[in-house]
Structures are given as C-alpha cells and as structure tokens.
C-alpha cells in the first residue's frame, strides 16, 4: 500500500450525530404531543390507560445522572422499536376509526423509524453492543372493540410521549460525556 | 483533512509477536469505535478487532481471540493492536478503521514465515 | 466461507446500471441491523459508500444506492463508469457472533 492520502470526513461527528439526534426526538416529541391533543379532542379520555404490552418507563428523569451511553441507547432502541410495532398495529387495527389522525400517525411512523436508525447509527460508530433483537413478540391482538383501539391509542400516544421526553433528557446529558 | 496512519508491520516467524500501531488526526478520534480489518494476499476483507470509542467494549474475532488485544489512548490518538503466537494464516495487510468503519488507513503488511 | 455472500463477479459496459446482492441471515441483515458498503480500488484501502443500508457519505456520487430488504441488501450502481471497476464488499454486524461481518466481495469488471 502506497502513502495514506487523507480522506475527506465522510459523515458528521458522532457528537454531531447525537445533536441531530437530540433535535430529531424532540421534534418527534412535539409530533406526538400535537398527536395527544388531537385525539383527546376527538376522543376525549376517561383517565389514564394502559396497554400491558407496551414497555414500561425506562426510569425518572431524575435518575438519568448514574446511566451510562451503552444502557441508555439500548434501552431507548428497545422501547423506541415496541412502540414502532404498536404504532404500526394501530393503524392498521384502526384504518376507519382513527381516519381524522391518518397523515399524522404515518409522519409519526416514518419519524420514529428514522430516529431508531440513527441510533443504531450511532452505536455503530461509537462501536457501542449491538444487542441481539428480542425474540419476536406474539403478534399484538385486535382491540375487541373501537373504544379498546381508542384506548389503546390513549395508552400508546401517552407512554411514547413520556419516553420520547426521557430520551431528550437523557441524550443531552449524555453529549456532555461523549 | 481525516488520516489514520499504521505502523509497525513486518516479517515475523510463526509464534512470534508484533504490535500495530494507528495514529489518527484530522477528526475526533476519541468519538468513534476503532476497528482492525485485514486482507490476506488476493482475499477478501476480514474483521478482526473492534474497540469501543472510551475503550470500554472489545470484541474479537474467532479466529484472534486470546492471541490478539485491541486497546487504545485516547489523548495519544492512537489505536493498538497487540499480536502474540502468530500463525502463517495471519499474513496479511492490516487495516486500521474509525467509526462505522467511516474512514481507513492505508494499511500496513504483516508477513508471518520461518 | 463468509457469513454474508455477494457474487464474486459481475460485469457491466459503460453507461448500463449493475447491481450486486448481498445475502444474509436473521443473524445479521434480518435483523434490522444496518448493512453498509466498501469499494476498493485495485492497491488501495476501502472506502465506506454507503452506509445504514442507503444512506451516501459526502463525496461520493448518486450514481450509487443501497437498498435492503429481509436478510439481503444491494447495491446499484448507475451511469456506470470504467473507474468504477474494483472490489466491493457489504458489511453488517452479526449478533450471534458479536461482531461485524463481510461479504466475500464483488469484482466488478467494465466491459
């Protein structure tokens, strides 16, 4: 091999990945509360709910200061693809129903997939485990009936909400480690 | 401009011992996973070593593990690659990379033989 | 044997469109890990030419795309150009070996 001739960067920083990424959550932050309010006033909600199937809440925002990069990108591409696959199930459990969020949802969908890319990205360059995928998940059953699927949404848009604001708090506090 | 720079190649007999060395500039090395790929004479690229950016994560190949140790010094910029109980097969040009691997050095050739 | 396999040829004439396959398993490529790509140029080290599956480094011409689907992924080069002869190689991690993997590589000829 002759002399190395520099290369050109071919990609930003990882530090500036993490700003992109940082914005792109927020932004998909802002989706989902605008998505929240839009649902609510349609299909105002009796309480809080929950679905079993989704994951719990990665931790208080509070106890962020102790994690580590590896735990906080694992964690967050876990939760991030299950709410994905719900997101996925819910529109296409409730195509007719939930018709008045349709282009939002989709935008939703295609943001949130982005951002699981580029966390992967992410932990690619950073060389951080690329965990095994989870066993597949059983296949998420039908709502029994149209205000289960709303409910379900209700339980979806809140938990992604909470988590997506998680990830902002956790992914600045990490750019000052990197 | 992004460079990475290895050294410390050469001809070393079977069971021999040789340590690789990759300096890097012109990009925050200290931000990126440090890789070593190499290629034997006319074959295809293989992985051998990967690092984490803060050190923290090693993985090895198969066919390297408990012989070859990847570490690195971040305020040195340099990755390392120690090699001990060589073997004919692992005559090769070895390539240090950053990142996905995003950027490569030039390489440099180990030649194992008696 | 590599985890990944691409052909280990493909030919094309100036100005045609090639593209080269990369197949894997759910170990790999299935699972929705990224794939990325490497062109080498006879006597000179790889350079990344796309990464996460489609995405082109700064520098390197639309004339090349990725694209992946299932357990494989390719590469299509367009307008194709005789300094685009050289080797190619796909790259994905490998979750049962905890490890990136490489494809055997493509020689791509220009007729």
């Known amino acids: 091999p002759g002399p190395p001739p520099g290369s050109p960067r071919a990609s930003p920083d990882p530090r500036a990945e993490l700003d992109s990424t940082v914005l792109l959550t927020r932004s998909l932050l802002e989706d989902t509360r605008q998505l929240t309010i839009q649902l609510k006033d349609k299909f105002p909600a009796d309480g809080d709910h929950n679905l079993d199937s989704l994951p719990t809440l990665a931790m208080s925002a509070g106890a962020l200061g102790a994690l580590q990069l590896p735990s906080v990108l694992t964690r967050l591409r876990a939760d991030l693809l299950s709410y994905l696959r719900h997101v996925q199930w819910l529109r296409r459990a409730m195509g007719s129903s939930l018709k008045t969020l349709e282009p939002e949802l989709g935008t939703l969908q295609t943001r949130l997939d982005r951002l699981l890319r580029r966390l992967q990205l992410l932990m690619s360059r950073l060389a951080l485990p690329q965990l095994p995928p989870d066993p597949p998940a059983p296949p998420l059953a039908p709502p029994s009936s149209t205000w289960g699927g709303i409910r379900a949404a209700h339980a979806i848009l809140g938990g992604l909400h909470l988590t997506l604001d998680w990830a902002v708090r956790g992914l600045l506090l990490l750019k000052t480690r990197l | 401009e992004v460079q990475l720079l290895e050294s410390g190649g050469g001809l070393v007999q079977p069971g021999g011992s040789l340590r690789l060395s990759c300096a890097a500039s012109?990009?925050?090395?200290?931000?990126?996973?440090g890789h070593w790929v190499r290629q034997a004479p006319g074959k295809g690229l293989e992985w051998v070593a990967l690092?984490?950016?803060?050190?923290?994560?090693?993985y090895y190949a198969d066919s390297v593990k408990g012989r070859f140790t990847i570490s690195r010094d971040n305020s040195k910029n340099t990755l390392y690659l120690q090699m001990n109980s060589l073997r004919a097969e692992d005559t090769a040009v070895y390539y240090c990379?950053?990142?996905?691997?995003?950027?490569w050095g030039q390489g440099t050739l180990v030649t194992v033989s008696s | 044997q590599s985890v990944l396999t691409q052909p280990p040829s493909a030919s094309g004439t100036p100005g045609q469109r090639v593209t080269i396959s990369c197949s894997g398993s759910?170990?790999?490529?299935?699972?929705?890990?990224?794939v990325h790509w490497y062109q080498q140029l006879p006597g000179t080290a790889p350079k990344l030419l796309i990464y996460?599956?489609?995405e082109r480094p700064s520098g390197v011409p639309d004339r090349f795309s990725g694209s992946k689907s299932g357990t494989s992924a390719s590469l299509a080069i367009s307008g194709l150009r005789s300094e685009d002869e050289a080797d190619y190689y796909c790259?994905?991690?490998?979750?049962?070996?905890?490890?990136?993997?490489f494809g055997g590589g493509t020689k791509l000829t220009v007729l």
């Open positions: 996460s599956n489609e």
């Open positions: 990379a950053a990142g996905v691997p995003d950027y």
């Open positions: 759910s170990s790999n490529i299935g699972s929705g890990l990224d």
């Open positions: 012109g990009f925050t090395f200290s931000s990126y996973g």
């Open positions: 790259a994905a991690w490998d979750s049962s070996l905890y490890g990136p993997v």
């Open positions: 690092i984490s950016y803060d050190g923290s994560y090693k």
